[in-house]
Interface confidence: medium
């Protein structure tokens, strides 16, 4: 349905609070370096303009598209050229090219200082002094650091952030109340950002067919009692929502997400028995709850798939008639029967089935050719099963920190050209799969582990695309979305890599090491470990363990010394010399 004024339509649908929040997020995700005050000024101007359009949809400029209105506003920023360089060239373009240009300049790794958390009393004072500004600042700081964060979900995070302060700033022990809540929001926020980044990469790099396939598989696992037509309707709507958000159309995205939540709650009976408690909640919480809802129970009497997808003589006829629908039904039927499989595995099985039909339906005896197709699935299923089993055993044996170190060594040997900060970040996150998934029952381990690894490896792909250094990484990232994880798993030691020259500066440490948090200490040590492997890629596990144990002992000794800096100055070169000798 068309509206005379799109901006008025969205303002009325979303309400002023959500409208302003979403516009702030949109602007912060596009112009990530602009100061907070500049963005607030732009948002206020857009909001005032929207109100004039609500009052009179025929007023001047109210008929313009949101991209035109928002793009024009962004292009009024005076320091665009100095701050953003070539991004300023976007402003010379017309829509839709201008918006595409802004999208291409989104920076997944902006050069912004890490957010420092002030003292609790300082935060509570700021919250009480100006709650609205405090919450806007949160939206701004998160959005500029995570330019693909799912905007309507970020509003939900902001609501939780507000609730945490409202509750804890009244508490007797403010810090004990607030800090765990902020830690939880930070960790959940990072996870949410990374998951959304994979959705956007899927849409932007592999097209909406890839996203729809992912969504069919995931929603069929969640809603195994729903009919295929129902799942397909949800997939179509969900694809529209994520396409909009990934494309910077945040008002449309939030509006359509609300419509989808409404539809799901009005049609619970034909979707899932698990939606009831979500549907009693207010909008932001409801949408979040629906997105995270647990899998419904599988219908008891599902027949074997073989009859329709292998034994039937009509397989090729049905496939030829409407390939995507037939494959979609296959994926739906397989996924609803297998909540114990990762989505990526289900997509690999669908690809294998498609490849078999492409080959066999052109053969002399198609039925004979595809009769054993389900047997071909076995190795595809066993590979992630074995991977999860082996890595969970390793995690249980080593604990999280040492498991991360094993992965650091493994991935540095595979792709030593990748920057050390990226290898440390990605390997630390890969290592978190243990604590997240290995404690789960067998039936939940693979979907948890492999789908989490896909999210983490997408982060590697996104960072690598910005500054490509490894053909192997490019190949694994671009050839096939569903085979990214197996592609990285299959990489071996890079024999062509020329070891990095030894640089003593890299292994020089100072007394400031002693005041770091446990996490920061780990990152320092893991940074050194990556540099060691880049210097000696063929070093054995035992050699590396010896060096790292010595490193830990050296740091511990100097941090206990009276004159810490003198200790580091004296013991540091000894540690470096001993390490070189051990690795020679």
């Amino acid at each position: 349905d068309t509206h005379k004024s799109e901006v008025a339509h969205r303002f009325k649908d979303l309400g002023e609070e959500h409208f302003k929040g979403l516009v702030l997020v949109a602007f912060s995700q596009y112009l990530q370096q602009c100061p907070f005050e500049e963005h607030v000024k732009l948002v206020n101007e857009v909001t005032e303009f929207a109100k004039t359009c609500v009052a009179d949809e025929s007023a001047e400029n109210c008929d313009k598209s949101l991209h035109t209105l928002f793009g024009d506003k962004l292009c009024t920023v005076a320091t665009l050229r100095e701050t953003y360089g070539e991004m300023a060239d976007c402003c010379a373009k017309q829509e839709p090219e201008r918006n595409e240009c802004f999208l291409q300049h989104k920076d997944d790794n902006p050069n912004l200082p890490p957010l420092v958390r002030p003292e609790v009393d300082v935060m509570c004072t700021a919250f009480h002094d100006n709650e609205a500004t405090f919450l806007k600042k949160y939206l701004y700081e998160v959005a500029r650091r995570h330019p693909y964060f799912y905007a309507p979900e970020l509003l939900f995070f902001a609501a939780r952030y507000k609730a945490a302060f409202a509750e804890c700033c009244q508490a007797a022990d403010k810090a004990a109340c607030l800090l765990p809540k902020l830690d939880e929001l930070r960790d959940e926020g990072k996870a949410s950002s990374a998951k959304q980044r994979l959705k956007c990469a899927s849409l932007q790099k592999f097209g909406d067919r890839a996203f729809k396939a992912w969504a069919v598989a995931r929603l069929s696992q969640k809603f195994p009692k729903a009919e295929f037509a129902e799942v397909s309707k949800l997939v179509t709507d969900l694809t529209k929502v994520h396409t909009e958000c990934c494309h910077g159309d945040l008002l449309e995205c939030a509006d359509d997400r609300a419509d989808l939540a409404k539809y799901m709650c009005e049609n619970q009976d034909s979707i899932s028995s698990k939606l009831k408690e979500c549907c009693d909640k207010p909008l932001l919480e409801k949408s979040h709850c629906l997105a995270e809802v647990e899998n419904d129970e599988m219908p008891a009497d599902l027949p074997s798939l073989a009859a329709d997808y292998v034994e039937s003589k009509d397989v090729c006829k049905n496939y030829a008639e409407a390939k995507d629908v037939f494959l979609g039904m296959f994926l739906y039927e397989y996924a609803r029967r297998h909540p114990d499989y990762s989505v990526m595995l289900l997509l690999r099985l669908a690809k294998a089935y498609e490849a078999t039909l492409e080959k066999c339906c052109a053969a002399a005896d198609p039925h004979e050719c595809y009769a054993k197709v389900f047997d071909e699935f076995q190795p595809l299923v066993e590979e992630p099963q074995n991977l999860v089993k082996q890595n969970c055993e390793l995690f249980e044996q080593l604990g999280e920190y040492k498991f991360q170190n094993a992965l650091l060594v493994r991935y540095t040997k595979k792709v030593p050209q990748v920057s050390t900060p990226t290898l440390v970040e990605v390997s630390r996150n890969l290592g978190k799969v243990g604590a997240k998934c290995c404690k789960l029952p067998e039936a939940k381990r693979m979907p948890c582990a492999e789908d989490y690894l896909s999210v983490v490896l997408n982060r590697l792909c996104v960072l690598h695309e910005k500054t490509p250094v490894s053909e192997k990484v490019t190949k694994c990232c671009t050839e096939s979305l569903v085979n990214r994880r197996p592609c990285f798993s299959a990489l071996e030691l890079d024999e062509a890599y020329v070891p990095k020259a030894f640089n003593a500066e890299t292994f020089t440490f100072h007394a400031d090491m002693c005041t770091l948090s446990e996490k920061e200490k780990q990152v320092k040590k893991q940074t050194a470990l990556v540099e060691l492997v880049k210097h000696k890629p063929k070093a054995t596990k035992e050699q590396l363990k010896g060096v790292m144990d010595n490193f830990a002992a050296f740091v511990e000794k100097c941090c206990k010394a009276d004159d810490k800096e003198a200790c580091f100055a004296e013991e540091g070169p000894k540690f470096v010399a001993a390490s070189q000798a051990a690795l020679a």
Partner: nanobody, 128 residues
């Protein structure tokens, strides 16, 4: 919501022909059996014809229309058709299109309960 819309009904002389169309709002409907039912005044709704998923698959007809009516579908247009020839006064009824939810190999059911989505119907009147 998923929608089904019938068209093509009207008034026709006995012995004449009509072609009913049934348009589905979703591409995914090509994956399901489709059926035509009819309901004459003061009578129960009854099965007329059905076609299983995808063109060229199984068709099924009520004995009263066998040889006179032909069901077909055009998946590219998300549409099913009922070609009615040699119409009789007793064919007068509201004709309903319905879409089932069976696995792809399934035969089109005759039982109303196996059809989940229904149109509002189109009136067919055959005068003698």
């Amino acid at each position: 919501q998923l929608q089904v819309v019938e068209s093509g009904g009207g008034l026709v002389q006995a012995g004449g022909s009509l072609r009913l169309s049934c348009a589905a709002s979703e591409r995914t409907f090509v994956a399901y059996p489709m059926g035509w039912f009819r309901q004459a005044p003061e009578k129960e709704r009854e099965f007329v014809a059905g076609i299983s998923w995808f063109a060229g698959a199984t068709t099924d007809y009520a004995d009263s229309v066998e040889g006179r009516f032909t069901i077909s579908r055009d998946n590219a247009k998300n549409t099913a058709y009922l070609q009615m020839n040699n119409l009789k006064p007793e064919d007068t009824a509201v004709y309903y299109c319905a879409i089932s939810h069976q696995l792809p190999g399934g035969r089109p059911g005759r039982d109303m309960d196996s059809y989940s989505y229904w149109g509002h119907g189109t009136q067919v009147t055959v005068s003698s």
